[in-house]
């Protein structure tokens, strides 16, 4: 049978040939009659055999990390017969390890984030080195980790590579640390190889700082002309934290006047002082308010850092603005009777300069030929007024500061012209009536109505009468309907076109005014030649042909 021990060849041997071991048949008596042959992987190139003795040599430098075993086949032949002495057999040559590989950190670069103020013992990251040497061969691949840089804030567990915090850190003092870790093989014994890696450890922010005003006093100004909502200035607190932990909210702590507000610009983290109510320099020319600032987000466990909010005082000076004159009323309504003489008093308007200077005021009326205004604001008439021409006047009164003619205010003034009874009633239209020669007594000739240009205080009431002369000798009579109309009726039977072709009746119309006014109005009545049916007529004026139907009402 075959005789051999297990074969090992150390890696990285520099000699031209290294004796690995010996293969032999137990039938070999040493008389050189047997020939040994090596077949298979690496035979002839990596390993050779002494054909006479069976000694195997490695003729190449081997790298265990490249290839750690070779499976070869051995043959032994009797030279005299050419026959195999033993059956072909496989054997293994193992490449034994030497410590020729340093530990390597394959997952570089390492970066970790840990919250600032984390307690001692907090796990940061685990670093792992690999050693290509044989882990089953002594301590060649047994590693120990140590910290080369990073004390006193960090520590590393020697066997695991776990980095932990060993001292609390404040991000506001230093926000990142470079830690250097060394891995040594041979568990750190002499002859060990080492590798290092750098770990960037960043501290994440916790909200351990409250916002603080750098300024204890801010001075701001606001124009008295500023509308509500105007931004009058900004205030700013500073927070050493970052991101969400530095977001802050400003608010008013004291403002007795409730004139101001503060809103927060969340992009710039500034407080914007806003005018909540309009200010008046003449009423109050300075204000004092107190503002405070707090973080927007505060975790319960970090409340100890946020017990008292930072405050600041804001002095606000109101700037005087030359304001236009101010009328006592937004508009005026005056009344004046019509027909009052030129120069009559209408009313007084009054404007004042709201500024401390108290400039005298000049008044004017825009585009009016009927009224005048003096420097005291007194409005008078320049003409007699007729209500029946214009019952209302809409005036625009302008007040101008004497010392600054650009400061102008205007208001409307409404003048109502009051009625007096200065118009008598009169026919509402021109009336021309007709009567047939054969008309009977009591026949309605015309219904008349009147109008009065005066304004009725309650309601117009007109009274209709014939003149005294017509009453005494009239062929016609009048009946007042008591509704501001009257009817004219025939007072006899039969008329003669040739003798009296036309009648002129004087009608008196009186109103119910105080004093009452009366007018005399003439009604013309034509006598016509009517046919039997009474539907056509021929009057004295042949050009006038009318078709009429007479009927007594």
């Amino acid at each position: 049978g075959w005789v051999w021990n297990q074969f090992f060849v150390p890696e990285e041997m520099n000699t031209t040939s290294h004796h690995v071991g010996r293969l032999r048949s137990d039938l070999d008596n040493g008389n050189n009659s047997f020939q040994y042959k090596l077949l298979g992987a690496g035979a002839g190139s990596t390993f050779i055999i002494d054909e006479r003795t069976g000694d195997i040599y490695a003729i190449e430098k081997l790298d265990r990390e490249e290839r750690s075993l070779y499976i070869l086949r051995a043959q032994v032949i009797d030279i005299t017969t050419g026959r195999a002495v033993e059956p072909e057999s496989e054997f293994v040559i193992k490449v034994s390890d030497i410590n020729d590989n340093e530990p390597k950190f394959l997952d570089e670069p390492y970066e970790a984030i840990v919250p600032e103020m984390s307690p001692e013992g907090t796990l940061v990251i685990q670093v792992t080195a690999s050693d290509a040497d044989d882990p089953s061969s002594g301590n060649n691949a047994r590693l120990l980790y140590s910290l080369l840089q990073g004390q006193p804030y960090f520590s590393v567990e020697p066997t695991t590579g776990v980095i932990r915090i060993s001292s609390k850190m404040d991000r506001e003092l230093q926000d990142e640390y470079w830690v250097i870790i060394q891995a040594k093989d041979m568990i750190g014994q002499p002859g060990a190889l080492s590798g290092t890696t750098s770990v960037l450890i960043k501290l994440s922010d916790v909200n351990d700082n409250k916002p603080i005003f750098k300024e204890s006093l801010y001075r701001l100004t606001v124009s008295e002309s500023a509308p509500t909502g105007t931004s009058i200035g900004t205030i700013m607190a500073y927070d050493n934290d970052i991101g969400e932990n530095a977001e802050m909210d400003y608010s008013i702590e004291e403002d007795d006047s409730q004139t101001f507000d503060i809103i927060t610009n969340h992009e710039t983290q500034e407080g914007i002082v806003i005018l909540k109510k309009k200010v008046n320099f003449e009423h109050q020319n300075h204000y004092g308010i107190r503002a405070k600032v707090k973080n927007h987000h505060v975790d319960e466990q970090l409340m100890k850092y946020h017990t008292e909010a930072s405050t600041t005082f804001i002095k606000i000076q109101v700037e005087d603005v030359d304001e236009p004159p101010l009328f006592l009323l937004p508009y005026y309504i005056f009344e004046i009777f019509e027909e009052t003489p030129q120069g009559s008093f209408v009313g007084v308007v009054s404007a004042t300069d709201p500024d401390n200077r108290k400039s005298p005021i000049r008044y004017s009326i825009t585009r009016s030929k009927v009224f005048n205004i003096d420097d005291n604001g007194t409005i008078t008439t320049t003409n007699s007024l007729d209500r029946e021409i214009s019952a209302w006047y809409n005036l625009s009164i302008t007040a101008t500061e004497k010392y600054n003619i650009e400061q102008i205010s205007s208001i409307p003034v409404y003048v109502q012209v009051l009625n007096i009874n200065d118009h008598a009633p009169e026919f509402s239209q021109y009336y021309e009536s007709y009567v047939c020669e054969n008309a009977g007594s009591g026949q309605v000739i015309q219904t008349i109505s009147a109008v009065d240009r005066d304004e009725s205080i309650e309601e117009h009431h007109f009274y209709f009468n014939l003149s005294v002369e017509d009453t005494n000798s009239s062929s016609f009579t009048i009946i007042d309907n008591q509704d501001n109309t009257a009817v004219i009726l025939t007072n006899r039977t039969g008329f003669n076109l040739q003798e009296e072709p036309i009648f002129y009746i004087s009608i008196l119309i009186a109103d119910n005014g105080i004093p009452s006014l009366t007018s005399t109005n003439t009604l013309t009545i034509h006598v016509c030649d009517c046919d039997d049916s009474g539907s056509t007529q021929t009057c004295q004026y042949q050009e006038l042909m009318l078709s009429m139907g007479f009927k007594t009402e």
Partner: antibody
Framework: QVQLQESGPGLVRPSQTLSLTCTVS??????????WSWIRQHPGKGLEWIGY???????YYNPSLKSRVTISVDTSKNQFSLKLSSVTAADTAVYYC????????????WGQGTLVTVSS | EIVLTQSPGTLSLSPGERATLSCRAS???????LAWYQQKPGQAPRLLIY???SRATGIPDRFSGSGSGTDFTLTISRLEPEDFAVYYC?????????FGGGTKVEIK
Amino acid sequence: QVQLQESGPGLVRPSQTLSLTCTVSGGSISSGGYYWSWIRQHPGKGLEWIGYIYYRGRTYYNPSLKSRVTISVDTSKNQFSLKLSSVTAADTAVYYCARVYSNYGWFDPWGQGTLVTVSS
Amino acid sequence: EIVLTQSPGTLSLSPGERATLSCRASQSVSSSYLAWYQQKPGQAPRLLIYGASSRATGIPDRFSGSGSGTDFTLTISRLEPEDFAVYYCQQYDTSPLTFGGGTKVEIK
């Protein structure tokens, strides 16, 4: 897991040099115990081993191609490359890269392959 | 170099049948250094068996390998539709590494 991907021109002129690169992902080319190999397959034919390389640079080539073949490695890019010079139409084939387990010599895994045609 | 001869060149079988593929080496090969691969059209080869008889990860147990010296066999106990492909043997025993010419298993 480890994956391999071949890349390079699909057409090469006769007498020129064929150049291919294999990019390794999901693992390091610097891992011990593996060779990084090139194999080719002529259209409709069997497989032919071209050669392989260890990450430290040691190469092993098929004697039939040795005079024309160069395999190199770039550990920083996790890539290895094949150069085959003086190509002829007979070099038209699908070229595969694969990982070889150095102790026992099996190929696993393989790239999906890239067809290289040698033509003028 | 070691020449690996695969037979038959083509094997026509039906799903469910047993397939026996042969790989003969021109000289003795260590069984540790023999592997089998499966290749489907348009795809790269896939490792089935290494060390002559060990199944690769994820390979169904209907695939088995055996043999030593110069004669090696791949057996598919019961053919599934996805098993129809070309099969190659490969040796690592002696440089250069060589592959067999392949056996095509096709549907009958």
